[in-house]
């Protein structure tokens, strides 16, 4: 499955939107910094079958979509930017969904590295618990926004490697 060029553009637009969403300086939130232990090894990608890599990317975007579509999120961020973010993420999910399904049905379901999916899920669990503990404060959301940008940057590297494999 070839990820369309629009997927890379959408990824770039998502990064831009996440940057635009910033409401306060991260420097004013230094006391709230947190290590979410991003599962970098799941994005280094050399050990991946293509189908696995696409599933991992899908999970990251799906969890990001769910994170930013909570009631608490809609209070924290500019509604107009959030709507744009949903649109971009939704389009990326559609692109990846088509790819995952294609990889699944070409010669049966490939072995899925379920531990990679679980590692991504656990990473977002840490983010969710952090927000809960911090009572969804503006600084907590800012720390999370910056963290999601970082995770998207890493997932972009994995996407680029996928494109080179094609």
């Amino acid at each position: 499955c070839d990820l369309p060029q629009t997927h890379s553009l959408g990824h770039r637009r998502t990064m831009m939107l996440l940057a635009q969403m910033r409401r306060i300086s991260l420097f004013s939130c230094l006391k709230d910094r947190h290590d979410f232990r991003f599962p970098q090894e799941e994005f280094d990608g050399n050990q991946f079958q293509k189908a696995e890599a696409i599933s991992v990317l899908h999970e990251v975007i799906q969890q990001t979509f769910n994170l930013f579509s909570t009631k608490d999120s809609s209070v924290a961020w500019d509604e107009r930017l959030l709507d744009k973010l949903y649109t971009e993420l939704y389009q990326q999910l559609n692109d990846l969904e088509a790819c995952v399904m294609q990889e699944v049905w070409v010669g049966g379901t490939p072995l899925m590295n379920e531990d990679s999916i679980l590692a991504v899920r656990k990473y977002f669990q840490r983010i969710t618990l952090y927000l809960t503990e911090k009572k969804y404060s503006p600084c907590a959301w800012e720390v999370v926004r910056a963290e999601i940008m970082r995770s998207f940057s890493s997932s972009r590297n994995l996407q680029e490697r996928l494109r080179r494999k094609e």
């Epitope: 599933s55 979509f65 769910n66 999910l93 699944v104 977002f124 669990q125």
Partner: antibody
């Protein structure tokens, strides 16, 4: 509000198959993995597996790989679990439960379908 | 697979009594992924405590959870009639996800 609707009961013959349904409402069906859990009368809970309704990928408990097949129909926002080659050991209540994170993990369950395997 | 052993299997407590249910894991479980569910006869399980110590929405403050590694517990500071139910611990720290066999809590 989030709801998962399951039929109350299914009576099936030994050796036959049954397809259980779980109809979702109140949220975006494709955004959350759907899980299935087995409970035999008066006993504990066993995790069977999960499916991502967005693309249909599945993850199974090895103990159920040859017994259960998970599928979804996005058009009817329904998850399915087919159980094959049924024996009395398969007589149980089967629940669907929605994934999520933090306080949303298995926060929503169907009412369960009682499967009775009897000649 | 991580086996979760709950004890006691059945216990009864008087109203006002302090109750502690335990859940022992066969291998270490990260506390973020240890949950408790309450189930009453004829009903589906209800999320009760998430990530070891956080009460789910609507759960009375007399409930608390604690633990780490292989040892976890659910405590009721003062037993009430409505607390009579089965309680299951659950882990999603590793596949396959598992549940404890449950503790049935009865009121005296």
């Amino acid at each position: 509000q989030v709801q998962l609707q399951q039929p109350g009961a299914e009576l099936v013959k030994p050796g036959a198959s049954v397809k259980l349904s779980c109809k979702a409402s109140g949220y975006t069906f494709t955004n959350y993995w759907m899980h299935w859990v087995k409970q035999r009368p008066g006993q504990g809970l066993e995790w069977i597996g999960e499916i991502n309704p967005s693309h249909g990928r599945t993850i199974y408990n090895e103990n159920f790989k040859s017994k259960a097949t998970l599928t979804v129909d996005k058009s009817s926002i329904t998850a399915f679990m087919q159980l094959s080659s049924l024996t009395s050991e398969d007589s149980a209540v089967y629940f669907c439960a929605r994934g999520g994170l933090g306080p949303a993990w298995f926060a929503y369950w169907g009412q369960g379908t009682l499967v009775t395997v009897s000649a | 697979q991580i086996v979760l052993t709950q004890s006691p299997a059945i216990m009864s407590a008087s109203p006002g009594e302090k109750v502690t249910l335990t859940c022992s894991a066969g291998s270490s479980v990260d506390s973020s992924y240890l949950y408790w569910y309450q189930q009453k006869p004829g009903s589906s399980p209800k999320l009760w405590i998430y990530s070891t110590s956080n009460l789910a929405s609507g759960v009375p403050a007399r409930f608390s959870g604690s633990g780490s590694g292989t040892s976890y517990s659910l405590t009721i500071s003062s037993m009430e009639a409505e607390d009579a139910a089965s309680y299951f611990c659950h882990q999603w720290s590793s596949y396959p996800f598992t549940f404890g066999s449950g503790t049935k809590l009865e009121i005296k």
